[in-house]
Amino acid sequence: EAGLPRAGGGSQPPFRTFSASDWGLTHLVVHEQTGEVYVGAVNRIYKLSGNLTLLRAHVTGPVEDNEKCYPPPSVQSCPHGLGSTDNVNKLLLLDYAANRLLACGSASQGICQFLRLDDLFKLGEPHHRKEHYLSSVQEAGSMAGVLIAGPPGQGQAKLFVGTPIDGKSEYFPTLSSRRLMANEEDADMFGFVYQDEFVSSQLKIPSDTLSKFPAFDIYYVYSFRSEQFVYYLTLQLDTQLTSPDAAGEHFFTSKIVRLCVDDPKFYSYVEFPIGCEQAGVEYRLVQDAYLSRPGRALAHQLGLAEDEDVLFTVFAQGQKNRVKPPKESALCLFTLRAIKEKIKERIQSCYRGEGKLSLPWLLNKELGCINSPLQIDDDFCGQDFNQPLGGTVTIEGTPLFVDKDDGLTAVAAYDYRGRTVVFAGTRSGRIRKILVDLSNPGGRPALAYESVVAQEGSPILRDLVLSPNHQYLYAMTEKQVTRVPVESCVQYTSCELCLGSRDPHCGWCVLHSICSRRDACERADEPQRFAADLLQCVQL
């Protein structure tokens, strides 16, 4: 079964780890109150303590299944032979209001289980209706969801979920919004939030698109809520660059997709190409993203309020090889303010009757924008026309850091005492620690000040998550979860080494002659007791 926590890391104190030798790990979430860690895997869901001791394991597979069976064999007998089939966890979300974990797998056409947070007891597994089948695609990192809690005391929770469909558009929508009922066995569980003859809370990939481009699909990399919108970062086949000829080379494009949280008819659907560019090199294959607040210094540099959202993203170079992208990659920064402004400008221009809807994969026709006197403000959520809408110009981010050798695979960020720290996972199993400061001398907007090994030689997967107290970072590879301290100040043995490291967490604690965080240093606020600047080392 699963291994015990054990030592890892090099010259630093050993990191706590959790190993799963038998089953590949896929997703990780951390409970923001208890700090407990939930891990999705192939055929398993694990509950771990904050220091990665195993508390519970829940078995989800293998199951007797065949992906050609629709509905699944548990619902209706199937003419296809059944075999022992792995159940890959593809979505793992905490439903705090209902004290449960939502774990969606690949088996039985992609059904979900609700597990009690305390002990992973299975509360329910809706599997009788077509709405219960999200997608049988096995690829773990291709589905993303956002859980929207209902208004306190009333209103229903809902799940926005995006998934690839592997050509089965008659079975699965690529994007949908589903009801989440309090009772796991409720017949309406996972029903579309709205559905009538013409309109519903879903988007299907048209069969025309699949006829022309059989490989067309949308892969959902990251999703988040910001203000009244839900956003997705996606990768999709670029139908403009890819030849319909199946033997031809496939090109991909990254898109940011936006929907209003309270738009059950999906009239607010907008998608824009997204990427960034540095020194003439285009980075267009989104690998991961992380929604954060900027920190006082960065907020000031960007002209933002400290409570505005920013998005850190990792893009690989070019537009080819989605599954094995080029190693060269870039860490980029977007402000949600700029993204919203670009989208609003596009909507306003369309409502002036300018141009087309420009969404070839979804419309298969060049519908013209319709002139309408509507006032389009920041909160506009669409009408039954001028939708769905595609952006024609790429939203470009600010490149912060380029890695030409290792390949960035994952990203997380937080604000430490007004400074913005980004953690980037790499292909070789390392965590790069990066200080973002747009006012850096020499014009370098980010400084990679430390690199630590989480698991040598194994790519860091997307779910890079901070502990609630921001003391640790949980990094996951296919076989291991590693708890990496956000700082290792104690490794620096002199004031010069300590402050020369440029780690924003670290300062020289005079009383004990050690490198530490300010809050770990006695009387740090008294003069000459805590050095936070290299110049102070000389004075001391």
């Epitope: 009538d196 013409f198 309109v199 026709k365 519908l367 013209g368 009408q383 039954d384 026309f385």
Partner: antibody, heavy 120, light 108 residues
Framework: QVQLVQSGAEVKKPGASVKVSCKAS????????MHWVRQAPGQGLEWMGI????????SYAQKFQGRVTMTRDTSTSTVYMELSSLRSEDTAVYYC?????????????WGQGTTVTVSS | SYELTQPPSVSVSPGQTASITCSGD??????ASWYQLKPGHSPVLVIY???KRPSGIPERFSGSNSGNTATLTISGTQAMDEADYYC???????????FGGGTKLTVL
């Protein structure tokens, strides 16, 4: 079930006005637009205009601009179409038809039709 | 103003396939819908958004739209399909909904 029930047949003199009602039931009245379409004897279908029951906004066919008025009463889930300055060529069957959107969708439910005869 | 042109009549033998065309300038850049109208009845929507079929409409009804022509196809035509058929689109210049002149389908 979803139903649109229209008012009865009318006979009018040239120059007069006619007001046809269309009462909706079986669905959320404000969630669907309402079109008005007519068919004159031996002729094809002709679109007259559309009303959004949610806010009351209207859009009329150029041909009927200035002569047609569409209104709604949300308390009774009823829409009205009034056509003024009637002429003999306005003799037709008038239909109300609901649609989930203004431009992109079909008219999926139709009233039974109201015959309006304009004759001196 | 925008115009949609349909053939006045189309004849077909039972069990055969009937095709009714509707032509208009760059019609493929608009959504076409089709309505069936029988004497003494109200119109019935049979196809919307070029090729989508409302629930309750038999699978033998299908639609397509490319170039300047939208087509309603009825495969395995039955006697009950005899009716007038109208195509419909929206004129983005005037804001008007436009109907074709109608096609009388006769099942021989």
């Amino acid at each position: 079930q979803v139903q649109l029930v229209q008012s009865g047949a009318e006979v009018k003199k040239p120059g007069a006005s006619v007001k046809v009602s269309c009462k909706a039931s079986g669905y959320t009245f404000t969630s669907y637009y309402m079109h008005w379409v007519r068919q004159a004897p031996g002729q094809g279908l002709e679109w007259m205009g559309i009303i959004n029951p949610s806010g009351g906004s209207t859009s009329y066919a150029q041909k009927f601009q200035g002569r047609v008025t569409m209104t709604r009463d949300t308390s009774t889930s009823t829409v009205y179409m009034e056509l003024s300055s009637l002429r003999s060529e306005d003799t037709a069957v008038y239909y109300c038809a609901r649609a989930p959107g203004h431009y992109y969708y079909g008219m999926d439910v139709w009233g039974q039709g109201t015959t309006v005869t304009v004759s001196s | 103003s925008y115009e949609l042109t349909q053939p006045p009549s189309v004849s077909v033998s039972p069990g055969q396939t009937a095709s009714i065309t509707c032509s208009g300038d760059k019609l493929e850049d608009k959504y076409a819908s089709w309505y069936q109208l029988k004497p003494g009845h109200s119109p019935v929507l049979v196809i919307y958004q070029d090729s989508k079929r409302p629930s309750g409409i038999p699978e033998r009804f299908s639609g397509s739209n490319s170039g300047n022509t939208a087509t309603l196809t009825i495969s395995g035509t039955q006697a009950m399909d005899e009716a007038d058929y109208y195509c419909r689109a929206w004129d983005s210049n005037t804001g008007d909904v436009v109907f074709g002149g109608g096609t009388k389908l006769t099942v021989l």
